[in-house]
């Protein structure tokens, strides 16, 4: 009915779009909720975050397991009182993902 | 002053976070602005889109060149009048990216 090769290509495409940990660029300051007078050099780091598609539109690709990885960055505080300091920054790295439904918000929360 | 190896690692991290085309999963129906009565199987495809960090917070990682790639997908229209059709779907694929300032919105727009 349909060309088997085309179906294979479509299936491979689908496999690659599935919800899974994907390398993503995250901005460290906003990730850590730092004040505007603290910034990092480089401002971004590469980590894995859940992304991709789910079988149902109402499902969300969410992390089921997380590790924290340490990245060495320069922390710069404004006003500049000292030389930029090399600090280890722990950033969340998603190691497992799953398409999950949303739970209703508790009426009293 | 700083350990040369550490600086090398930081620089490599920074290079990898730079604004560039990155493989991304996009939902076809919303990409094409299709009505809720049309959906695709698989619902998502992999294409390259601009992403990553810029040196300044005021800059945005934007596409400077785009190609359109064709993906074979099943288009399913509801009500289902016929068997799902295998159609070529053209999706934007970013081939070049640059950190650009956001254009000021026209005050009268």
């Amino acid at each position: 009915f349909y060309d088997i090769e085309t179906l294979k290509v479509i299936d491979e495409e689908w496999q690659r779009t599935q919800c899974s940990p994907r390398e993503t660029c995250v901005e460290v300051a906003s990730e850590l909720g730092k004040s505007t007078n603290t910034f990092f050099k480089p401002p971004c780091v590469n980590v894995f975050r859940c992304g991709g598609c789910c079988n149902e539109e109402s499902l969300i690709c969410m992390n089921t397991s997380t590790s924290y990885i340490s990245k060495q960055l320069f922390e710069i505080s404004v006003p500049l009182t000292s030389v930029p300091e090399l600090v280890p920054v722990k950033v969340a790295n998603h190691t497992g993902c799953k398409c999950l439904p949303t739970a209703p918000r508790h009426p009293y929360s | 002053f700083y350990d040369i190896e550490t600086l090398k690692v930081i620089d490599e991290e920074w290079q990898r976070t730079q604004c560039s085309p990155r493989e991304t999963c996009v939902e076809v129906a919303s990409e094409l602005g299709k009505s809720t009565n049309t959906f695709f199987k698989p619902p998502c495809v992999n294409v390259f889109r601009c992403g990553g960090c810029c040196n300044e917070e005021s800059l945005i990682c934007m596409n400077t060149s785009t190609s359109y790639i064709s993906k074979q997908l099943f288009e399913i229209s509801v009500p289902l009048t016929s068997v799902p059709e295998l159609v070529p779907v053209k999706v934007a694929n970013h081939t070049g990216c640059k950190c650009l300032p956001t254009a000021p919105r026209h005050p009268y727009s």
Epitope: W14, N55, E57, S58, T102, P104, P107 | F39, K41
Partner: antibody
Framework: QVQLVQSGPEVKKPGASVKVSCKAS????????MHWVRQAPGQGLEWMGY????????YYNQKFQDRVTLTVDKSTSTAYMELSSLRSEDTAVYYC??????????WGQGTLVTVSS | DIVMTQTPLSLPVTPGEPASISCRSS???????????LHWYLQKPGQSPQLLIY???NRFSGVPDRFSGSGSGTDFTLKISRVEAEDVGVYFC?????????FGGGTKVEIK
């Protein structure tokens, strides 16, 4: 066309287990989640959970969490629902339902499970 | 759990006349993605339920255009513009926004 054919009626004793099968045809089995819903005699519909046949991921209604197990056999495009520690309140028609991208769209014909001593 | 309340419980109708069923949810059914997963099913006597309307107002395959859905947030309505004899059965609303998925208690439509 999409078809979900379920196994025949079952009569079970309290405390026993039941396994209902649902054979799918007319679509790519691994591309759609399979949900299970039950309907007690003269009652409404109660959602039990779903399975993603592609990777076997399951999500259960907390009410059934400890007693229900959803599985699939990809080679035969068949989904299974096993309910253990049966009690009389579990007497119901059990449906498998394919989930389209937007909603649960195609239902099996239902399997009546009667729990009686 | 989200409670779905349907009214009326029973709806005697005259063929050719319009009919309306109401469904109210205990919480908003607007998903974080902006969509509303409120669906309507019809269970004809001795049959499995069948999908009529999905995402509030979209008619499913083969569903006649006399059926229409509307509403938002927590209040939804299914309308039949001109009831036909084949429309008898129990109508259920269902929410697919949150888990557990829940259904209304049903509205039995019968010919007068």
């Amino acid at each position: 066309q999409v078809q979900l054919v379920q196994s025949g009626p079952e009569v079970k004793k309290p405390g026993a287990s039941v396994k209902v099968s649902c054979k799918a045809s007319g679509y790519t089995f691994t591309g759609y989640n399979m949900h299970w819903v039950r309907q007690a005699p003269g009652q409404g519909l109660e959602w039990m959970g779903y399975i993603d046949p592609y990777n076997g991921d399951t999500y259960y209604n907390q009410k059934f969490q400890d007693r229900v197990t959803l599985t699939v056999d990809k080679s035969t495009s068949t989904a299974y629902m096993e309910l253990s520690s049966l009690r009389s309140e579990d007497t119901a028609v059990y449906y498998c339902i394919r989930a389209g991208y937007y909603a649960m769209d195609y239902w099996g014909q239902g399997t009546l499970v009667t729990v009686s001593s | 759990d989200i409670v779905m309340t349907q009214t009326p419980l029973s709806l005697p109708v005259t063929p050719g006349e319009p009919a309306s069923i109401s469904c109210r949810s205990s919480q908003s059914l607007v998903h974080i993605n902006g969509n509303t997963y409120l669906h309507w099913y019809l269970q004809k006597p001795g049959q499995s339920p069948q999908l009529l309307i999905y995402k509030v107002s979209n008619r499913f395959s083969g569903v006649p255009d006399r059926f229409s859905g509307s509403g938002s947030g927590t209040d939804f309505t299914l309308k039949i513009s001109r009831v036909e004899a084949e429309d008898v059965g129990v109508y259920f609303c269902s929410q697919g926004t949150h888990v557990p998925r829940t259904f209304g208690g049903g509205t039995k439509v019968e010919i007068k």
